[in-house]
């Protein structure tokens, strides 16, 4: 990946838009297509006051853990979808796009140095375990994806890119 491509806000906005489209295509979280089993996903809620005061290295750990769990979740959803009879083509397309998007974001974050932080996280023993919740519909899964990108990931890259500029 070109160095620091993630620091171009248009790049992340493209993936956010894809995630929002996927959420919209699943027709709302109440009546949309259900997952045949619950999938564990990261809790995307953020205390933004506290987040802004975290060290960028600590933010990187949370982002990387969230991204890993999200990737697992969407791969799991893909497997469940493949096993279902007559999967909707549009849904399959958005799952594929999400998997591709997460792979790209993972590569872009590696360039930014986020993975280094996971290898040797600061005060690893004190790091709070990643909060999770369960998704039972494709809509909820895509909403978590969208909220994760718009929340923790965007905030982290903003700070990490600003730090890299100095």
């Amino acid at each position: 990946a070109p160095p620091r491509l993630i620091c171009d806000s248009r790049v992340l906005e493209r993936y956010i838009l894809e995630a929002k489209e996927a959420e919209n295509v699943t027709m709302g979280c109440a009546e949309g297509p259900r997952l045949s089993e619950n999938i564990t996903v990261p809790d995307t809620k953020v205390n933004f006051y506290a987040w802004k005061r975290m060290k960028v290295e600590e933010q990187a750990v949370e982002v990387w853990q969230g991204l890993s769990l999200l990737s697992e979740a969407i791969l799991q959803a893909q497997a469940l979808q493949a096993n279902s009879s007559q999967p909707p083509e549009s849904l399959q397309l958005h799952i594929d796009k999400a998997i591709s998007g997460l792979r790209s974001l993972t590569s872009l974050l590696r360039v930014l140095g986020a993975q280094k932080e996971l290898m040797s996280p600061p005060d690893a023993t004190q790091a709070a375990p990643l909060r999770t919740l369960t998704a039972d519909t494709f809509c909820k899964l895509f909403r978590v994806y969208s909220n994760f990108l718009r929340g923790k990931l965007k905030l982290y890259t903003g700070e990490a890119c600003r730090r890299g500029d100095r």
Epitope: V46, F48, R53, K154
Partner: antibody, heavy 116, light 109 residues
């Protein structure tokens, strides 16, 4: 104790600028972001923007972009909010608020009156 | 941009339970903060991270959040609870804080 003390009331003419100060004491000024929130008479709270006192970077509410400037002087633990091109609708009490796990410490407020 | 909607006023009888709502698109996916403001005073936080109480705030104050609505619940309402209450959250698209319009709580009796 931890407190934020703001500058006194101001009366300004439309089109002028106002600069409100907020002096922090009782804590490490650069360890907490500072937000500015305003409240027009009889109206609700309106968030204007924040500044990171350590680095000086800012983020403003869309409504105030281009008219508001937030700065700080770390040597005297003071944050500033300057609003330009004032209009009568800018008449309000302006608060600075420290960001802990939430807006945990507020200044006493500064009344800015815009009148011709 | 993201908007939070609150009822202009809520009335409750002394000793009864008051519920103040705050509506916003998928607000259940976000943390919500509630501030109490009495006339001529700066706001004071009563609930943070949706349902946590800072020290000094009575247990009578609680918060919940699901779907498109967050709720501040004040049980056994007292005369001293009369105030304006504001919900606050975050606009993910602009990285900015957002306040609701505020609700005036009146305690009757």
């Amino acid at each position: 104790q931890v407190q934020l003390v703001q500058s006194g009331a101001e009366v300004k003419k439309p089109g002028a600028s106002v600069k409100v100060s907020c002096k922090a004491s009782g804590y490490t000024f650069t360890s907490y972001y500072m937000s500015w929130v305003r409240q027009a008479p009889g109206q609700g709270l309106e968030w204007m923007g924040w500044i990171n006192p350590l680095k000086g970077n800012t983020n403003y509410a869309q409504k105030f972009q281009g008219r508001v400037t937030m700065t700080r002087d770390t040597s005297i633990s003071t944050a500033y909010m300057e609003l330009s091109r004032l209009r009568s609708e800018d008449t309000a009490v302006y608060y600075c608020a420290r960001e802990g796990m939430y807006f945990d410490i507020w200044g006493q407020g500064t009344l800015v009156t815009v009148s011709s | 941009s993201y908007e939070l909607t609150q009822p202009l006023s809520v009335s409750v009888a002394l000793g009864q339970t008051a519920r103040i709502t705050c509506s916003g698109d998928s607000i259940g996916d976000k943390y919500v903060y509630w501030y109490q403001q009495k006339p001529g005073q700066a706001p004071v936080l009563v609930i943070y991270d949706t349902n946590k109480r800072p020290s000094g705030i009575p247990e009578r104050f609680s918060g919940s959040n699901s779907g498109n609505t967050a709720t501040l619940t004040i049980s056994r309402a007292q005369a001293g609870d009369e105030a304006d209450y504001y919900c606050q959250s975050w606009d993910l698209d602009f990285n900015t804080y957002v306040f609701g319009g505020g609700t005036k709580l009146t305690v009757l009796g």
